[in-house]
Amino acid sequence: KTLVLGKEGESAELPCESSQKKITVFTWKFSDQRKILGQHGKGVLIRGGSPSQFDRFDSKKGAWEKGSFPLIINKLKMEDSQTYICELENRKEEVELWVFKVTANSDTHLLQGQSLTLTLESPPGSSPSVQCRSPRGKNIQGGKTLSVSQLELQDSGTWTCTVLQNQKKVEFKIDIVVLAFQKASSIVYKKEGEQVEFSFPLAFTVEKLTGSGELWWQAERASSSKSWITFDLKNKEVSVKRVTQDPKLQMGKKLPLHLTLPQALPQYAGSGNLTLALEAKTGKLHQEVNLVVMRATQLQKNLTCEVWGPTSPKLMLSLKLENKEAKVSKREKAVWVLNPEAGMWQCLLSDSGQVLLESNIKVLPTWSTPVQP
């Protein structure tokens, strides 16, 4: 018995070959002897039942001259899994068709961190093995259900599942979209008084995007977090619902989600968490955003440089006179120089030599007041 594997919804070709390699009379039947189709000597395809009943069944007329009389079954259904009989030249050939189906649990659009379950449906009597490969090349294998917990952004794309049965294989491709922000976390470094822009690009595109979101902010100087803004998203249009009066935030109405602060101030330095709840999805998307603010000041004989906000302990804060070696350099959030000499001083926040933030302050001779450019 010949075995043919098929995929639900697609087409399968069941072979039937003549030894004489020329056109001959043939009939395809179900195992219960009901006729499907055939050719009775006039080169015309005759169907066995009503057109509606047999419209999915066909043959390749072009192959008949070569002695090939395949049965083509279109739009395969799971119930097409059975034995088909080809009668020709006083012999019967049995062809077994097994139709398989691989589906993703409930939805192919899943939130980052959620689980993906791939389920194989197979005909009774079959014992296939299945292996799926993620877009980032990770292989998972198992029985009729395969699960991946904690989906990551890199899991977005085409998953390829190979079903193996009796050394024959059939391949399924399933497009999975992991709903997430492009970055889990971002950090913005600003001098005091500068404008601040926060961007929250999504890592996916869908035709219609609807949901609601909120930005909670934990200022370093504050004892508790505060909701800065709430908004709705309807068909990719952002509409602000409620916004705090301090700071005076503005939010763009188009994607990607984008917020602006008129100026960076020490009291705003801290961490925010933007959450986005999408319509018909359980759970929320999250992106963390951090704001570090620098201020350089001179009070009487003391030149001070301070940073506020979430800085890593390995960051270095330095004060140096332009074109000279750093006068002071510490892994701390404030540095100062007593009785600084006149000139342009630079306050630098750096990470392994890379400058993240810089603020200049001009120190005038002792009889005058400092100027901040």
């Epitope: 309807k234 249009e237 939010m251 763009g252 109405k253 188009k254 008129p262």
Partner: antibody, heavy 119, light 107 residues
Framework: EVELLESGGGLVQPGGSLRLSCAAS????????MSWVRQAPGKGLEWVSG????????YYADSVKGRFTITSDNSKNTLYLQMNSLRAEDTAVYYC????????????WGKGTTVTVSS | AIQMTQSPSSLSASVGDRVTITCRAS??????LGWYQQKPGKAPKVLIS???SLQSGVPSRFSGSRSGTDFTLTISSLQPEDFATYYC?????????FGQGTKLEIK
């Protein structure tokens, strides 16, 4: 070709009301955001009000908030601006404008209709 | 609301001159700014969208750029038909706001 035609302008006394209409042809109305923009005699352009394609979200300039109402009727492909408690400073040419598919810009404008508020 | 400060308010120039008009936004507005041309008695016409995207049918002598919250419209070589009033418009967020306008006149 997309065309916008405003109507409903005229002379009205302070405190009175007027409803402007903007009939659109050559487009699927519900797809695009729309706006009303005005220009007082000898002055610059002032954005007045906007509405999302779905009609669910409406927006207003502070100068007209609480007095003007923007609506749309997708079945009639028409945008409206209901103006109540009119003031002398509302005297202007009122233009309706269609926004691009992704709200990129106002790509189609009507010729405008004149509103005069005077006693 | 976001304020748009446009300068200069008027400008005299000659055919062939290079002209720049600037708009400053009171907040960061990404690239969500357009430039519009208006001639007396006519409706405005969009020249540039999203800071630098030239609209179809608009001559290439018009260009737009951005530096932070400063936006610039440049006309590389003025033509007689360019004498008009120019407006910037921020469409970053509602309420939208126009600049005060720049009237470009023949010197």
């Amino acid at each position: 070709e997309v065309e916008l035609l405003e109507s409903g302008g005229g002379l009205v006394q302070p405190g009175g009301s007027l409803r402007l209409s903007c009939a659109a042809s050559g487009l699927t109305f519900s797809t695009f955001a729309m706006s009303w923009v005005r220009q007082a005699p000898g002055k610059g352009l002032e954005w007045v009000s906007g509405i999302s394609g779905s009609g669910e979200n409406t927006y207003y300039a502070d100068s007209v908030k609480g007095r003007f109402t923007i609506t749309s009727d997708n079945s009639k492909n028409t945008l409206y601006l209901q103006m109540n408690s009119l003031r002398a400073e509302d005297t202007a040419v009122y233009y309706c404008a269609k926004e691009g598919y992704n709200w990129n810009y106002m790509d189609v404008w009507g010729k405008g209709t004149t509103v005069t508020v005077s006693s | 609301a976001i304020q748009m400060t446009q300068s200069p308010s008027s400008l005299s120039a000659s055919v062939g001159d290079r002209v720049t008009i600037t708009c400053r936004a009171s907040h960061g507005i990404r690239n969500d700014l357009g430039w519009y041309q208006q001639k007396p008695g006519k409706a405005p016409k969009v020249l540039i969208s999203e800071t630098s995207s030239l609209q179809s049918g608009v001559p290439s002598r018009f260009s737009g750029s951005r530096s932070g919250t400063d936006f610039t419209l440049t006309i590389s070589s003025l033509q007689p038909e360019d004498f008009a009033t120019y407006y910037c418009l921020q469409d970053y967020t509602y309420p939208y706001t126009f600049g005060q306008g720049t009237k470009l006149e023949i010197k």
